[in-house]
Amino acid sequence: MAVTACQGLGFVVSLIGIAGIIAATCMDQWSTQDLYNNPVTAVFNYQGLWRSCVRESSGFTECRGYFTLLGLPAMLQAVRALMIVGIVLGAIGLLVSIFALKCIRIGSMEDSAKANMTLTSGIMFIVSGLCAIAGVSVFANMLVTNFWMSTANMYTGMGGMVQTVQTRYTFGAALFVGWVAGGLTLIGGVMMCIACRGLAPEETNYKAVSYHASGHSVAYKPGGFKASTGFGSNTKNKKIYDGGARTEDEVQSYPSKHDYV
């Protein structure tokens, strides 16, 4: 039950996180005009990964796409790439995790396969979250660097009568959305990985074996076995009751070498 809850919660948290990463990537407010030097401007500037916008006090907003690839800063391209990789990995992770959910039955899928898929999706979510956090952090670092550079420029060479106030940019809402979304995806991924451990069918201490003796039906339970070497450690025990006897484990699922990863 706890495993199902952990897996389900991990999926939901990751889903919210990836939706947030997509939203952040599409948002225009990655950087917004810093109004410290000109708080009374009638024109407000903000920029995203794909276009820059100008909002006038009148309510009119004008956006222009970056219709060039080669002319854009390498850092911006890197951030775009990180965010897209994050989205793609997250989307694949979501697809995989849907089939891995314990509450969803698809044919005769074994628990071992579900465990593997849960782990795979968990790792994908972790990498997706890290990509988003890295992308947003790179952009934030770029903003901080440019902010202080333009501040330095602002206070040099102002001896003339004409002031040319350089537009400075500060953190936009998309950065915070990206950080939170990346964090959620990461947490969701970790939860999936934790759920994977619980999903992997461990061998129990007591093997329940039933066999038929002539005249009586007796349930015989050999005790005292501790699986010390993983799967296959009790094969001798199983072979004793070959004549029609089955362990409870054999009835439910067949152990596989993939169960522990």
């Epitope: 000109n38 009374v40 401007t41 009638a42 024109v43 500037n45 920029q47 820059s52 916008c53 100008v54 006038e56 006090s57 009148s58 309510g59 009119f60 004008e62 222009r64 004409v162 002031q163 040319t164 106030v165 537009t167």
Partner: antibody
Framework: QVQLKESGPGLVAPSQSLSITCTVS????????VHWVRQPPGKGLEWLGV???????NYNIALMSRLSISKDNSKSQVFLKMNSLQTDDTAMYYC??????????WGQGTSVTVSS | DIVMTQSPSSLTVTAGEKVTMTCKSS????????????LTWYQQKPGQPPKLLIY???TRESGVPDRFTGSGSGTDFTLTISILQAEDLAVYYC?????????FGSGTKLEIK
């Protein structure tokens, strides 16, 4: 067509307050902002303030303490209220429609004289 | 506040001549985000309210004759009347609409000989 018409008291005693109404037609106040501009006799134009479609306002800092702009969208009216008038507030007061921060349509103006 | 300085303060010219007046702002009116200069030119004829001529420094308002041309960027702007006509007798104002308060220049009074 677009029209703006100012109506005011004409004469105001010093230290009294001034109220001017700008009645608009041909456009909606929920879509356009309205500016207030004044012009003392024989002098240049002075921007007073603006009220935007959402109801938010911006004022000339020099007059901010005694200036108030409001509106009634349903009546298509914009109101200018100015307190503590002095003789140098004597001017022609205009309201004008905003279009992308420029003023494309102006009213004929209302003359305000501050005198005892 | 942005200070708008217009020159000359008055100008006496003959009909048919080319007229140029300038407007300087104490701060750049160029918005880097959309490459627009938030400067507007108005014409005010005697006894009338001002009339919008040019916005964004160079975009002519519809209905304005093409003899009126606005140019310039940043802090230096020019209004040119290519062939002056008698009806152009007016005061011309430039206005900053980039930063509050929206300040006007003191105007250039155009008189015809």
């Amino acid at each position: 067509q677009v029209q703006l018409k100012e109506s005011g008291p004409g004469l105001v005693a010093p230290s009294q307050s001034l109220s001017i109404t700008c009645t608009v037609s041909g456009f909606s106040l929920t879509s356009y902002g309205v500016h207030w501009v004044r012009q003392p006799p024989g002098k240049g134009l002075e921007w007073l303030g603006v009220i935007w479609p959402g109801g938010n306002t911006n004022y000339n800092i020099a007059l901010m303490s005694r200036l108030s702009i409001s509106k009634d969208n349903s009546k298509s009216q914009v109101f200018l209220k100015m307190n503590s008038l002095q003789t140098d507030d004597t001017a022609m007061y205009y309201c004008a429609r905003d279009r992308r921060l420029a003023m494309d349509y102006w009213g004929q103006g209302t003359s305000v004289t501050v005198s005892s | 506040d942005i200070v708008m300085t217009q020159s000359p303060s008055s100008l006496t010219v003959t009909a048919g001549e080319k007229v140029t007046m300038t407007c300087k702002s104490s701060q750049s009116l160029l918005e880097s985000g959309n490459q627009k200069n938030y400067l507007t030119w108005y014409q005010q004829k005697p006894g009338q309210p001002p009339k919008l001529l040019i916005y964004w420094a160079s975009t002519r308002e519809s209905g304005v004759p093409d003899r009126f041309t606005g140019s310039g960027s940043g802090t230096d702007f020019t209004l040119t009347i290519s062939i002056l006509q008698a009806e152009d007798l007016a005061v011309y104002y430039c206005q900053n609409d980039y930063s509050y308060p929206f300040t006007f220049g003191s105007g250039t009074k155009l008189e015809i000989k």
